[in-house]
Amino acid sequence: EVEKTACPSGKKAREIDESLIFYKKWELEACVDAALLATQMDRVNAIPFTYEQLDVLKHKLDELYPQGYPESVIQHLGYLFLKMSPEDIRKWNVTSLETLKALLEVNKGHEMSPQVATLIDRFVKGRGQLDKDTLDTLTAFYPGYLCSLSPEELSSVPPSSIWAVRPQDLDTCDPRQLDVLYPKARLAFQNMNGSEYFVKIQSFLGGAPTEDLKALSQQNVSMDLATFMKLRTDAVLPLTVAEVQKLLGPHVEGLKAEERHRPVRDWILRQRQDDLDTLGLGLQGGIPNGYLVLDLSMQEALS
C-alpha cells in the first residue's frame, strides 16, 4: 500500500478541478499543492468538495498563510468560510465590499454567527467608519444589525449613512441606541419638507427630545400610537394635552387603550384632569382640580 504521506503516482493535481472530489482525504493532502490551491481559489467555490475535504483545504491554506489569508483568497472561500473560526477571521484584513458581500452570501438566511460578527467588525474597523454602502449591505443581510451595535459604535455612523436605514432595521434598538441615531437622522433629513421629513424621521423618534416633539406637534403629522408608545418617557412628560392632541391628530383616541402603559400612564399622571377631560376619552388619573403641582426637581436644581 502507498505510504499515506506520499502522493500516488499520476495523482498529483495540475489544477483544481472536479476530479479531486474523488480523492481521499490523505490523497488531497498529499497531491494538492497549497500554492496551486491559493491561485485557483475561484474554482473551489464551483466544486462541491465533501465536508471532510473542506477541512483538508482549510488546513492547506492555514499552513500557507499562518498570519492570515490574503483578500484574493478570502473573496473565494465560499462554504470554506463556514469552516473558519473567529480566531482565523481576526487575522484577516478585509477591505473590499465585494469580499464582504461574497462571504455574507454564504451565510444568507441564517442568524448572524460569531464568524460573521467578527468579519463585520474587522471590515468596519478597517474602513474607520460605517459608511452608507457598508450599512446598505449589512442591513440587507441582517436587518437587526444596527441595533446590535453599542451606542459607542453607533457614534461612528456618519449622518449620510442614515439614508440606508429602513424602519425594520430599528425594530430591536433600545432607547440608548436611538439617542445616538436620532440626532444623526435629524441632520440627514433636515432639508426635507414637513410630511416627507416625518415619514423618514418617524422610526428614529424614540431618541427625540421634548422640544422636537413640541415642534412636530405644530406640523399636523398625525403620529400613530405605535410610534408614540416608543417615545422616551422623559420627552413625553412635559408635553401638554393640547400638544399631544396635535401630535397624534386622529390617532389621539388610541390613548384610552394605552392608558395603563408607559409613557401614556406616566404622562396622564402629570396632566390636569380638567385638561384630560377635554379629550373626551375618559382618561382618568390626572391631577384633580384645585391641586397645586410643585416641580421639586427644578427646586433642587436651583438650590
Epitope: P48, Y51, E111, S113, P114, Q115
Partner: nanobody, 119 residues
Framework: QVQLVESGGGLVQAGGSLRLSCAAS????????MYWYRQAPGKERELVAF???????NVRDSVKGRFSVSRDSAKNIVYLQMNSLKPEDTAVYYC?????????????WGQGTQVTVSS
C-alpha cells in the same frame, strides 16, 4: 437538521442491477450537494457519486458507465442506479450531505444499506 434514510440494498448476482434511494427530510432547502459513499469490509470509506442542487453529477472512475446518480427534487429523494454489478461493489452504501447552519457546516449521514454482489 437533516435526516437521511437509504433503502434498496440487497443480495444480487454479478451483472445484475439495483437502485438505491436516499430520502431526505428536515432542512432540505439548505441542501446543496448529496453524496453516495461506500465502505467495503476492512477498507476505507470512498466517495462513489454526487449530485449537486443544480443537477450536475459525477461518479468515480471505477464505476463510470455502470453507476449513475439522479434526484427527484419534489420528493427530496436521490437515487444511485447501479448496473453491471461486480463482486467488488459489495459494501455498505451511505448517503451524505452537509448544510450551513448557525454559522458553520453540519454533516449528516444515513444509516447505510448493504449491497452484496455474489459471483
Amino acid at each position: 437538521q437533516v435526516q437521511l434514510v437509504e433503502s434498496g440494498g440487497g443480495l444480487v448476482q454479478a451483472g445484475g442491477s439495483l437502485r438505491l434511494s436516499c430520502a431526505a427530510s428536515g432542512s432540505t432547502s439548505s441542501i446543496n450537494t448529496m453524496y453516495w459513499y461506500r465502505q467495503a469490509p476492512g477498507k476505507e470509506r470512498e466517495l462513489v457519486a454526487f449530485i449537486s442542487s443544480g443537477g450536475s453529477t459525477n461518479v468515480r472512475d471505477s464505476v463510470k458507465g455502470r453507476f449513475s446518480v439522479s434526484r427527484d427534487s419534489a420528493k427530496n429523494i436521490v437515487y444511485l442506479q447501479m448496473n453491471s454489478l461486480k463482486p467488488e461493489d459489495t459494501a455498505v452504501y451511505y448517503c451524505n450531505t452537509y448544510i450551513p447552519y448557525g454559522g458553520t457546516l453540519h454533516d449528516f449521514w444515513g444509516q447505510g444499506t448493504q449491497v452484496t454482489v455474489s459471483s
